[in-house]
């Protein structure tokens, strides 16, 4: 698994480098998670033909995965820093149950799946420090999450593979949108 941001030997070997700003740290953290997702997607796509599934087929799912919409203020048109930041944090918190589901779904990339999950927790902490209006952030209900997890794990094998593929694809898209928005802040 790749070394998490801020822990690679090059940082230690270069004492004169300027410490990363909060924004740079967040940017680096997101890119690190995206690398992890790419590795997981590679295993998923090699194992089955899920990656060839049409967008239409994937759209008809029972999941409620976070997605960026115009009203969230993260797009260039109608950009709103505070609203957008709340959406990013809320979305990441909602993704956590799906990242938990991904654990034990990979044979050769088990560590990678754990790294994505842990790095996302760190990213949430970074963003929460940046956010002023923490009251607007709703945390998912643990009981609801627990029953959702049970339901996802009860699916037949093909559905579980399809769900894994969809979670990775949606999480990647959400992080890419977040990265673009955060670069405007």
């Amino acid at each position: 698994a790749p070394v998490p941001p801020g822990e690679d030997s090059k940082d230690v070997a270069a004492p004169h480098r300027q410490p990363l700003t909060s924004s740079e740290r967040i940017d680096k953290q997101i890119r690190y998670i995206l690398d992890g997702i790419s590795a997981l997607r590679k295993e998923t796509c090699n194992k089955s033909n899920m990656c060839e599934s049409s967008k239409e087929a994937l759209a008809e799912n029972n999941l409620n995965l976070p997605k960026m919409a115009e009203k969230d203020g993260c797009f260039q048109s109608g950009f709103n820093e505070e609203t957008c930041l709340v959406k990013i944090i809320t979305g990441l918190l909602e993704f956590e149950v799906y990242l938990e589901y991904l654990q034990n779904r990979f044979e050769s990339s088990e560590e990678q799946a754990r790294a994505v999950q842990m790095s996302t927790k760190v990213l949430i902490q970074f963003l929460q420090k940046k956010a002023k209006n923490l009251d607007a952030i709703t945390t998912p209900d643990p009981t609801t999450n627990a029953s959702l997890l049970t339901k996802l794990q009860a699916q037949n094998q093909w559905l579980q593979d399809m769900t894994t593929h969809l979670i990775l694809r949606s999480f990647k898209e959400f992080l890419q949108s977040s990265l673009r928005a955060l670069r405007q802040m």
């Epitope: 008809e60 699916q155 037949n156 093909w158 559905l159």
Partner: antibody, heavy 120, light 111 residues
Framework: EVQLQQSGAKLVKPGASVKLSCTAS????????MHWVKQRPEQGLEWIGR????????KYDPKFQGKATITADTSSNTAYLQLSSLTSEDTAVYYC?????????????WGAGTTVTVSS | DIVLTQSPASLAVSLGQRATISCRAS??????????MNWFQQKPGQPPKLLIY???NQGSGVPARFSGSGSGTDFSLNIHPMEEDDTAMYFC?????????FGGGTKLEIK
């Protein structure tokens, strides 16, 4: 021709164990999931569990956990169902069935069934 | 577990007429545009035989008089025209979740 050949009828005493076999021909069990289903006289069908012979991963209905053990021997292309601590409630016909991985999820080939009678 | 309720428990239909068997699931068995509902026919002393998979797809070698429909929680199996050979027990089965579950069965006879 794709077939599942099951072992013959068994008459066993209460408290004993029994091991049923299901031998596949016309396909490799490693490419499928092998399931076991119970049917009591004049009753419905109950799923017991399944094995993925490629990695010996098993799943059971909680009500058969501890009662049933599913195994597979890929060299003989055979799946097994072992039932322990038998009681009259275990008197039934036991079917093995094949399930192929894919978009649709169904039992397409069934064995003829093995009748297990528990009696002293 | 997903509970499947079949109705009626028994049915008598005249030769050449239509037989309709219903199956209701305790929750939706749909996902990704697929209905994970299958139908089986079972004759005395024989194993179940696949008739319909994915709610409406015919199993291999199944006569065209057998058809399935429905989505979500409500499904039905239609047999038309009814033939002598169709006297049997019919079961619905969901494969969306583990454990896969079966309906209680419908006994179809000739009137």
């Amino acid at each position: 021709e794709v077939q599942l050949q099951q072992s013959g009828a068994k008459l066993v005493k209460p408290g004993a164990s029994v091991k049923l076999s299901c031998t596949a021909s016309g396909f490799n069990i490693k490419d499928t999931y092998m399931h076991w289903v119970k049917q009591r006289p004049e009753q419905g069908l109950e799923w017991i569990g399944r094995i993925d012979p490629a990695n010996v991963n098993t799943k059971y209905d909680p009500k058969f956990q501890g009662k049933a053990t599913i195994t597979a021997d890929t060299s003989s292309n055979t799946a097994y169902l072992q039932l322990s601590s038998l009681t009259s409630e275990d008197t039934a016909v036991y079917y093995c069935a094949r399930l192929l991985y894919g978009r649709y999820w169904y039992f397409d080939v069934w064995g003829a069934g093995t009748t297990v009678t528990v009696s002293s | 577990d997903i509970v499947l309720t079949q109705s009626p428990a028994s049915l008598a239909v005249s030769l050449g007429q239509r037989a309709t068997i219903s199956c209701r699931a305790s929750e939706s068995v749909d996902n990704y545009g697929i209905s994970f509902m299958n139908w089986f026919q079972q004759k005395p002393g024989q194993p179940p035989k696949l008739l319909i998979y994915g709610a409406s797809n015919q199993g291999s070698g199944v006569p065209a008089r057998f058809s399935g429909s429905g989505s979500g929680t409500d499904f039905s199996l239609n047999i038309h025209p009814m033939e002598e050979d169709d006297t049997a027990m019919y079961f619905c089965q969901q494969s969306k979740e583990v454990p896969p579950t079966f309906g209680g069965g419908t006994k179809l006879e000739i009137k």
